[in-house]
Every structure is written in structure tokens, then in C-alpha cells.
């Protein structure tokens, strides 16, 4: 049997026998274009494609539409994989989204959505989510129905205020809504009473800025 040489996601890499977490090269669906991603092969059976990670504030997440489209940062540390790749990938098959969160008191929580996809750029990478379970709140901290993606230079939210400018970072802002995992990173002891921090309302409330976040996707039939 011929060995697979291109992979569209980390689940395919895992199934090929490469089961060590790390940076791998993925290929856009129906294309030869490549992108580097971090694959988590340990959490919940492995095969997760990490699409966002925050851990120390080393990367500026107040970026342009183009940068959020194409991705930025380092897959070994803080990064955003890229809306275009994620949109194309999740448009091909059914994916689940797992969001892992850490607070500054040593607690961890997660939200798992059993169906996740991003619409195309023509629809401002609108997020679609169903089937929430997990420990980070019984109500979704990503507004339902899903919002369009907004950045500092592309305001697609439902608030006159331009949420991305006010709250920092590109996100699926509503008006402005209960979450922003791409907000300003605040260190310990400076992480409360922040409007523009890393927020997941239905776990930690409105003014709390989280220590670490990871967003990862995997095919629903993995």
C-alpha cells in the first residue's frame, strides 16, 4: 500500500501512524498549498488540529483581516492557524471543536461542540456551532447563532462600537458578546477587571482574563 504523503488534518496524520504531538505540514483541501500546524496527539485520543493557542502573551493577536485569514504566530507557541484553511477544511467534512481553557488558579475546563464549521470569506468566516457539552459552562460562550468574524480593520459585529478595536483581537463578536479568546493577554494579578482580556464568560465571568487557551478540531467520525 502506497504511503500517504499529504495530509489535510492531524487526524489523517495520526491514522498514518505518526502519533507524536508536534508541528506537521498540512495541505489545503483540493490544493497543493501547505500550512504548518500543531497536532495534539495526546488529548482525548489524539488527532487534533490546533487552530488557536494562547499561553504567555508572546504573540500580538490584534491583527488584520489578512493575518487572521492566513494565520500568524508559531505553532510551537501562540498562534492562529488561519481562517481560510479552517474554512476550507471544515467545509469538506464534519468536524468537532474542542476548546481547552486554563485560569490563573490552576483550574482547567473545556467546551466541546459536536459540529463546527466556518463559512467562507464571502460570509466573513461566520462560525457555525452545535451540540455543546463540557465543563466551561452550560451555555455557549460563543454567541448563537454564530457571528461573522471581525478584526480591527474589518468590522462585522452587531455593535456600533467596533468590538475588535474596543476589546482587541479578531473574533466572532456579537455585540460584543460572551467570549474573546484572542483578547489582550494579561499576566497573573493583572487579569481581573479587564474589558479586553481573554474572556470565556460562562466559565469565569465578564472581567476575568484567562491564562491559557487552545482551540482544536478533529473529524467527527475519528
Amino acid at each position: 500500500k502506497e504511503e500517504q504523503t499529504t495530509f489535510r488534518d492531524c487526524a489523517e496524520i495520526f491514522k498514518s501512524g505518526l502519533t507524536t504531538s508536534g508541528i506537521y505540514t498540512l495541505t489545503f483541501p483540493n490544493s497543493t498549498e501547505e500550512i504548518k500546524a500543531y497536532c495534539d496527539m495526546d488529548v482525548g485520543g489524539g488527532g487534533w488540529t490546533v487552530i488557536q493557542h494562547r499561553e504567555d502573551g508572546s504573540v500580538d493577536f490584534q491583527r488584520t483581516w489578512k493575518e487572521y485569514k492566513e494565520g500568524f504566530g508559531s505553532p510551537l507557541g501562540e498562534y492562529w492557524l488561519g481562517n481560510e484553511f479552517v474554512s476550507q477544511l471544515t467545509g469538506q467534512h464534519r468536524y468537532v471543536l474542542k476548546i481547552q481553557l486554563k485560569d490563573w488558579e490552576g483550574n482547567e475546563a473545556h467546551s466541546l461542540y459536536d459540529h463546527f464549521y466556518l463559512a467562507g470569506e464571502e460570509s466573513n468566516y461566520r462560525i457555525h456551532l452545535t451540540g455543546l457539552t463540557g465543563t466551561a459552562g452550560k451555555i455557549s460562550s460563543i454567541s448563537q447563532p454564530g457571528s461573522d468574524f471581525s478584526t480591527k480593520d474589518s468590522d462585522n459585529d452587531k455593535c456600533i462600537c467596533k468590538c475588535s478595536q474596543m476589546l482587541s483581537g479578531g473574533w466572532w463578536f456579537d455585540a460584543c458578546g460572551p467570549s474573546n479568546l484572542n483578547g489582550q493577554y494579561y499576566p497573573q494579578k493583572q487579569n481581573t477587571n479587564k474589558f479586553n482580556g481573554i474572556k470565556w464568560y460562562y466559565w469565569k465571568g465578564s472581567g476575568y482574563s484567562l491564562k491559557a487557551t487552545t482551540m482544536m478540531i478533529r473529524p467527527a467520525d475519528f
Epitope: Q165, M166, P178, G205, G207
Partner: antibody, heavy 121, light 107 residues
Framework: QVQLVQSGAEVKKPGASVKVSCKAS????????MVWVRQAPGQGLEWMGY????????GYNQKFEGRVTMTTDTSTSTAYMELRSLRSDDTAVYYC??????????????WGQGTLVTVSS | DIQMTQSPSSVSASVGDRVTITCKAS??????VAWYQQKPGKAPKLLIY???TRDTGVPSRFSGSGSGTDFTLTISSLQPEDFATYYC?????????FGGGTKVEIK
């Protein structure tokens, strides 16, 4: 209609504590943050902090940290603000006010009638 | 904390006059500014939010403008019931802060 009704005027001695209540009606109490703002006689407005009735989360103005506690009783749709170690310069009208948004402490669209707290020996 | 400097501190005007009150923030607050009206012995009342959006039921003679650090409240034609004190309020960062107030008095 949406209403916030506060407890009556209080006279306290320096060093004492005061607890002001604010009963909400006409809306879902847990859907909006509540803030407390005070106004010394003839002076401007000063934000003291907020409480989120949905989860009990609070955020206080550093100026009052350690002296103020904000709580809610969701069964009676009532918010409380307790201020301890009172000084004469705490003499003020204390207002509760509702924020327009659950997720952020934006602007304040509904206000209580105010509670005058006088601190005097 | 962000300082909100309001001017003038008081203004004497007549019914029908156009009154302009300004508020300057010590740093950029985007458009996260509200304006309130307060009458003696009463609680403040929300007039304007997001710098220029009138709250429900607020007469059209009240208008707000500005962004960044400079904001204005304008009463286009002063009415008898408008004699009051007006406060600006920034809510772009903790703690939210208010201007010192502008008292609009009858000339």
C-alpha cells in the same frame, strides 16, 4: 416597567458598616450586571464596582478594595452593597444602576433613586 | 485611571439656546462614552451611549459626537426641562470614570 428601588437613608458612626439594598423589578435580574455609583454632596459621580447576578462575579474600584462587598439574592432580585470602616468622607448618596449588557460593564441605563448615607460622630 | 475633563463646569443659557458641552479623555476611549442628565435630588438619567446613540425616549435635540479623546454633547434648542447637570462617562476600561459635570443654569 423596569425599576430599581433602594433602601432608606442611613446615619452611621465612623468605623461602622452600612449595607444598602437595591430591589430590581420589571426585567430578568440575572441578565444584566449591576453597578454601584456614589455621589458625595455637591460632587460628581464615582463608580464603586459591579456584580454579575448570573454568577456572583464582582469587580471593585481599587479605591474601595477591601472595604466594599457586593452581593445579590437572586430569589428576591435584590443587590446589596456593604461598605465597612466608614469615614466622614463616605457621606454620599449611593446609587445602584443596571448595565445595558450582561457580558460587559458598559453604560448604565436604569438607576435606583439613591440612598443617602451620612457618616457622623 | 482615565480622567474625563468636562468643560465648562457651568453654563448660563436661555430657553431656545444651543448649548455645547465637551469632555476630554486622558487617553483613547474609542467611542465608549455615555452622557447622563441629573436634576437636583434625582438619579442620573442616560441620554447618549456609544458617543452618539440616543437612548430610547430621549428627545432629538440632544446629540452626541466624538471619538478617541474628544467628545461633545449638544442641546440644539434648550427647553425649560433641560436645566440640569450633565456628566460624561467613559467605559472603555476599568474603572469606569465620570467627568466632573456641567451645570446648565437659567440665564
Amino acid at each position: 416597567q423596569v425599576q430599581l428601588v433602594q433602601s432608606g437613608a442611613e446615619v452611621k458612626k465612623p468605623g461602622a458598616s452600612v449595607k444598602v439594598s437595591c430591589k430590581a423589578s420589571g426585567y430578568s435580574f440575572t441578565d444584566y450586571n449591576m453597578v454601584w455609583v456614589r455621589q458625595a454632596p455637591g460632587q460628581g459621580l464615582e463608580w464603586m464596582g459591579y456584580i454579575d447576578p448570573y454568577n456572583g462575579g464582582t469587580g471593585y474600584n481599587q479605591k474601595f478594595e477591601g472595604r466594599v462587598t457586593m452581593t445579590t439574592d437572586t430569589s428576591t432580585s435584590t443587590a446589596y452593597m456593604e461598605l465597612r470602616s466608614l469615614r466622614s468622607d463616605d457621606t454620599a448618596v449611593y446609587y445602584c444602576a443596571r448595565t445595558r449588557d450582561r457580558y460587559d460593564v458598559w453604560y448604565f441605563d436604569v438607576w435606583g433613586q439613591g440612598t443617602l448615607v451620612t457618616v457622623s460622630s | 485611571d482615565i480622567q474625563m475633563t468636562q468643560s465648562p463646569s457651568s453654563v448660563s443659557a436661555s430657553v431656545g439656546d444651543r448649548v455645547t458641552i465637551t469632555c476630554k479623555a486622558s487617553q483613547d476611549v474609542y467611542i465608549a462614552v455615555a452622557w447622563y442628565q441629573q436634576k437636583p435630588g434625582k438619579a442620573p438619567k442616560l441620554l447618549i451611549y456609544w458617543a452618539s446613540t440616543r437612548d430610547t425616549g430621549v428627545p432629538s435635540r440632544f446629540s452626541g459626537s466624538g471619538s478617541g479623546t474628544d467628545f461633545t454633547l449638544t442641546i440644539s434648542s434648550l427647553q425649560p426641562e433641560d436645566f440640569a447637570t450633565y456628566y460624561c462617562h467613559q467605559y472603555s476600561s476599568y474603572p469606569p470614570t465620570f467627568g466632573g459635570g456641567t451645570k446648565v443654569e437659567i440665564k
